[in-house]
C-alpha cells in the first residue's frame, strides 16, 4: 500500500481542501473511525488499484486517524493497512469531542491506559489534572492519542490554552471493575405452578461487575420474548441478580430454563438450568404404601408417617374413627406436617405413651381446592404377654394337671416344657417340650378368648400329665410379637408325702430358653 502524501502526520489548514491517494495491488478503501468515506476508486492499466479521498472545507473536527486498507481486509497483516494522522488546527474547536465510551474508562487490572483528550493543533501545550484540580499531573502526552499512564480510580480533565482562552476537556472517569471467575446459581420461586400462575426465576452471580445474562426458556423458542430485570442482592456489592418473570404461565411454559452468564473481560462464562413444570390444575399424590394394619406397643410412643406430593400446599387433617384429631393439650397426640421439598410433604401422627383406647380406624386427609387424597389404616395396640396364673392340681382320676393363664396382643403362643433333673435344670439340661405326642404321657387343651374392651387375647391352657413318677419342673412360656413371659411349677408324684411348688419368673431364668411353640388350640372363643 502506498499513501500520497505519505505522512505519517499531516497538518492542514482550516477551510482548505486536500486530496489523499492510496494505491495497492488489490481494491483499496479509505476509512475513518471504522467507517468507509466517500471516495473515488479506480483501476489502472497495470492492474494497480487506487482510491482518492478529497477532504473539503476542513475544520478542526476533521482531525484524527485515517486508514487506507485493502477492500477485504479481514485477516490481513498490519503492514497491509496504512495509517495517516491529520491535524487541522482550529481555534474554534477546543478538545475533540468524545463519545461516552471514551469518557468512562473501565479497567480490570492495574495496567497502562490512555485518557484520550486530543486537540486539533499539535503545537498546543496540554496538561492533565484531576477534575476540579489545578495541579498538572506528570503524565506523558501524545497529541495523536492523549495521556498514557497508570491512573487511580478518579476523574480527570485535560486543559489547554488557545490564544488567551483556557479550555477544559470533558471529565474522564477511570474506574476499576470487579471481575472474577463466574459461578452462577439459579433458583425459582417455585418449580411447579398451575397454569395462570406466575413463573419467577432468579439467576445470581457473585463477584463480578461486568456480566451479561442470557436466558433460554420454552417461550423464547416460540419467539415470545420476556424482558429480564437485573438488580442487586441485599447488602452485597457485586451480587448481581437477573430476574425472569413470566406472568400467567401456560402449559407450554413447562420445560428447561437456562441462565447463561458471560463476562467479556476475561471471556469467562457459566450456565445453570432448572426445570419448571406447569400443571393444568393442582394435585395431591400419595408416595409409597402404608399398610392397612399398623401396630403400636402399649405405653411406648409410636409415630405414623404418610409421605405425599402436592401443589399447591394442601390442608392436612387426621381423623380417628371419623372424629378430627388435634394436638392434645395433655401431649398424648402430636400432629405435624412438614415440607421436605418444594412439593413433597411428610405428615406425622405421634401417639405418646400409647393407650389401649388409641386403637382404632385412622385416616389422614390432604386436600386443596383442586384435589384431595386420603389414606386409612387400622391401628392395633400390641400388649406384651403376661402369665397371670400357673397352678397345679391332681383330680381324683389320678392324673395331674397344670393350668396356665395369660394375656397379650397379638394372640400369644403357649409353650409347655418340663425338666426332670431338678439339680441340673435349667442350666445344664435342655428342657423337653410337652404336648400331644405319644411319647409324652401328657395331653394339652388350650382355649383362646378375645376381650373386646381390653382389646387383647386371653389364653388358658391345661396340661394333663398321666404318670409323674418323680418331681418335675413344668414351665409355661407365653410369647407374642412384642415379648414373652414364663412361670414354672414343680409337680411331685402322688406317692410323695409333700408337694413343693415354686413359681419362677422369666427374669429369674435369665430368659435363656428359647423354645418353638407347639399349639393345640381346642377352643377359640371371642366375647
Amino acid at each position: 500500500l502506498v499513501i500520497t502524501p505519505p505522512g505519517p502526520e499531516l497538518i492542514l489548514n482550516v477551510s482548505s481542501t486536500f486530496v489523499l491517494t492510496c494505491s495497492g495491488s488489490a481494491p483499496v478503501v479509505w476509512e475513518r473511525m471504522s467507517q468507509e468515506l466517500p471516495q473515488e476508486m479506480a483501476k489502472a492499466q497495470d492492474n494497480t488499484f487506487s482510491s482518492v479521498l478529497t477532504l473539503t472545507n476542513l475544520t478542526g473536527l476533521d482531525t484524527g486517524e485515517y486508514f487506507c486498507t485493502y477492500n477485504d481486509s479481514r485477516g490481513l497483516e498490519p503492514d497491509e493497512r496504512k495509517r495517516l494522522y491529520i491535524f487541522v488546527p482550529d481555534p474554534t474547536v477546543g478538545f475533540l469531542p468524545n463519545d461516552a465510551e471514551e469518557l468512562f474508562i473501565f479497567l480490570t487490572e492495574i495496567t497502562e491506559i490512555t485518557i484520550p483528550c486530543r486537540v486539533t493543533d499539535p503545537q498546543l501545550v496540554v496538561t492533565l489534572h484531576e477534575k476540579k484540580g489545578d495541579i498538572a499531573l506528570p503524565v506523558p502526552y501524545d497529541h495523536q492519542r492523549g495521556f498514557s499512564g497508570i491512573f487511580e480510580d478518579r476523574s480527570y480533565i485535560c486543559k489547554t490554552t488557545i490564544g488567551d482562552r483556557e479550555v477544559d476537556s470533558d471529565a474522564y472517569y477511570v474506574y476499576r471493575l470487579q471481575v472474577s471467575s463466574i459461578n452462577v446459581s439459579v433458583n425459582a420461586v417455585q418449580t411447579v405452578v398451575r397454569q395462570g400462575e406466575n413463573i419467577t426465576l432468579m439467576c445470581i452471580v457473585i463477584g463480578n461487575e461486568v456480566v451479561n445474562f442470557e436466558w433460554m426458556y420454552p417461550r423464547k423458542e416460540s419467539g415470545r420474548l420476556v424482558e429480564p430485570v437485573t438488580d442487586f442482592l441485599l447488602d452485597m456489592p457485586y451480587h448481581i441478580r437477573s430476574i425472569l418473570h413470566i406472568p400467567s404461565a401456560e402449559l407450554e411454559d413447562s420445560g428447561t430454563y437456562t441462565c447463561n452468564v458471560t463476562e467479556s473481560v476475561n471471556d469467562h462464562q457459566d450456565e445453570k438450568a432448572i426445570n419448571i413444570t406447569v400443571v393444568e390444575s393442582g394435585y395431591v399424590r400419595l408416595l409409597g404404601e402404608v399398610g392397612a394394619l399398623q401396630f403400636a406397643e402399649l405405653h411406648r410412643s409410636r409415630t405414623l408417617q404418610v409421605v405425599f406430593e402436592a401443589y399447591p400446599p394442601p390442608t392436612v387433617l387426621w381423623f380417628k374413627d371419623n372424629r378430627t384429631l388435634g394436638d392434645s393439650s395433655a401431649g398424648e397426640i402430636a400432629l405435624s406436617t412438614r415440607n421436605v421439598s418444594e412439593t413433597r410433604y411428610v405428615s406425622e401422627l405421634t401417639l405418646v405413651r400409647v393407650k389401649v383406647a388409641e386403637a382404632g380406624h385412622y385416616t389422614m386427609r390432604a386436600f386443596h381446592e383442586d384435589a384431595e387424597v386420603q389414606l386409612s389404616f387400622q391401628l392395633q395396640i400390641n400388649v406384651p404377654v403376661r402369665v397371670l396364673e400357673l397352678s397345679e392340681s391332681h383330680p381324683d382320676s389320678g392324673e395331674q394337671t397344670v393350668r396356665c393363664r395369660g394375656r397379650g396382643m397379638p394372640q400369644p403362643n403357649i409353650i409347655w416344657s418340663a425338666c426332670r433333673d431338678l439339680k441340673r435344670c435349667p442350666r445344664e439340661l435342655p428342657p423337653m417340650l410337652l404336648g400331644n405326642s405319644s411319647e409324652e404321657e401328657s395331653q394339652l387343651e388350650t382355649n383362646v378368648t378375645y376381650w373386646e374392651e381390653e382389646q387383647e387375647f386371653e389364653v388358658v391352657s391345661t396340661l394333663r400329665l398321666q404318670h409323674v413318677d418323680r418331681p418335675l419342673s413344668v414351665r409355661c412360656t407365653l410369647r407374642n410379637a412384642v415379648g414373652q413371659d414364663m412361670q414354672e411349677v414343680i409337680v411331685v408324684p402322688h406317692s410323695l408325702p409333700f408337694k413343693e411348688q415354686k413359681l419362677i419368673s422369666e427374669e429369674d431364668l435369665g430368659g435363656e430358653q428359647k423354645l418353638i411353640s407347639e399349639e393345640d388350640l381346642h377352643h377359640h372363643h371371642h366375647h
Partner: antibody
C-alpha cells in the same frame, strides 16, 4: 465553563402545559445522560425524568408518567421537558442535571451521580 | 420503587464537630449511592458517588461508606461552609430517588 441553563418556567393554571428547556455548554452534551430534578417550595429534591444520549431510553417518576415527556436535541445541546395536564403539586423549581451514567458494562449501568446542575427555573401551577 | 430514608432530619452541630448522616434504602442498591450538598436558593452540589468515592474538588473531610441498604456520610470536622442540607440519592434499574434531606444547622 461547564454550564447548564434552564428556561421556560412560569405561572400556569392547573391542567395547562409548559415546555422547559435546558441549554448546555462547555462539554460534549451528546455523550451524557441528562436528568430533570424538581424541588417543591420548602421540600426536598425529587427526580423527575432522565434520558439516554440517543433518546433510546427514557425513564420517569411514577407521579409524572403519561403527563411529562423528556427529549433532547444534541445538535442544539438542549434538553427539554414537556409538561402537560399540570397539577398544583407540580409547583417547584425544576433543575436540569448532567447524569453520569457510563455505557453499559454487561447487563446493568454503573452510576457516578449528577455532577453538573443548572440554576433552576420556577414552575408555579395555580388557579 | 426504592425508598431512601435519611436520619436525622435536622442536626444541630458546632464548628469542629464530627457529623454523621445515615441513609437507608428499602432494598439493596449495591453501592450506587450519591451524596449532595445544597445551600438555600442554590442548586445541589455532588459530594460523593458510588457510596464512597469523593468527587473531585470536594474537601477530604467529607467521606462516605456503606453498601447494600445502609449508608453514611461523615464530615470529620464541621466547617462554617458546611452548614447546609444534605441529600442521598440512589440509582438502580434506571430510576433515581432522593432521601428527604438532613439539615445541618448551627447549634
Amino acid at each position: 465553563q461547564v454550564q447548564l441553563v434552564e428556561s421556560g418556567g412560569s405561572l400556569v393554571q392547573p391542567g395547562g402545559s409548559l415546555r422547559l428547556a435546558c441549554t448546555a455548554s462547555g462539554f460534549t452534551f451528546s455523550s451524557y445522560w441528562m436528568s430533570w430534578v424538581r424541588q417543591a417550595p420548602g421540600k426536598g429534591l425529587e427526580w423527575v425524568a432522565n434520558i439516554q444520549q440517543d433518546e433510546n431510553e427514557k425513564y420517569y417518576v411514577d407521579s409524572v408518567k403519561g403527563r411529562f415527556s423528556i427529549s433532547r436535541d444534541n445538535a442544539k445541546k438542549s434538553l427539554y421537558l414537556q409538561m402537560n395536564s399540570l397539577r398544583v403539586e407540580d409547583t417547584a423549581v425544576y433543575f436540569c442535571a448532567r447524569d453520569l451514567v457510563p455505557p453499559r458494562q454487561g447487563d446493568y449501568y454503573h452510576y457516578f451521580g449528577m455532577d453538573v446542575w443548572g440554576q433552576g427555573t420556577t414552575v408555579t401551577v395555580s388557579s | 420503587d426504592i425508598q431512601l430514608t435519611q436520619s436525622p432530619s435536622t442536626l444541630s452541630a458546632s464548628v469542629g464537630d464530627r457529623v454523621t448522616i445515615t441513609c437507608r434504602a428499602s432494598q439493596s442498591i449495591s453501592d450506587w449511592l450519591a451524596w449532595y450538598q445544597q445551600k438555600p436558593g442554590k442548586a445541589p452540589n455532588l459530594l460523593i458517588y458510588k457510596a464512597s468515592t469523593l468527587e473531585s474538588g470536594v474537601p477530604s473531610r467529607f467521606s462516605g461508606s456503606g453498601s447494600g441498604t445502609e449508608f453514611t456520610l461523615t464530615i470529620s470536622s464541621l466547617q462554617p461552609d458546611d452548614f447546609a442540607t444534605y441529600y442521598c440519592q440512589q440509582y438502580n434499574s434506571y430510576s433515581r430517588t432522593f432521601g428527604q434531606g438532613t439539615k445541618v444547622e448551627i447549634k
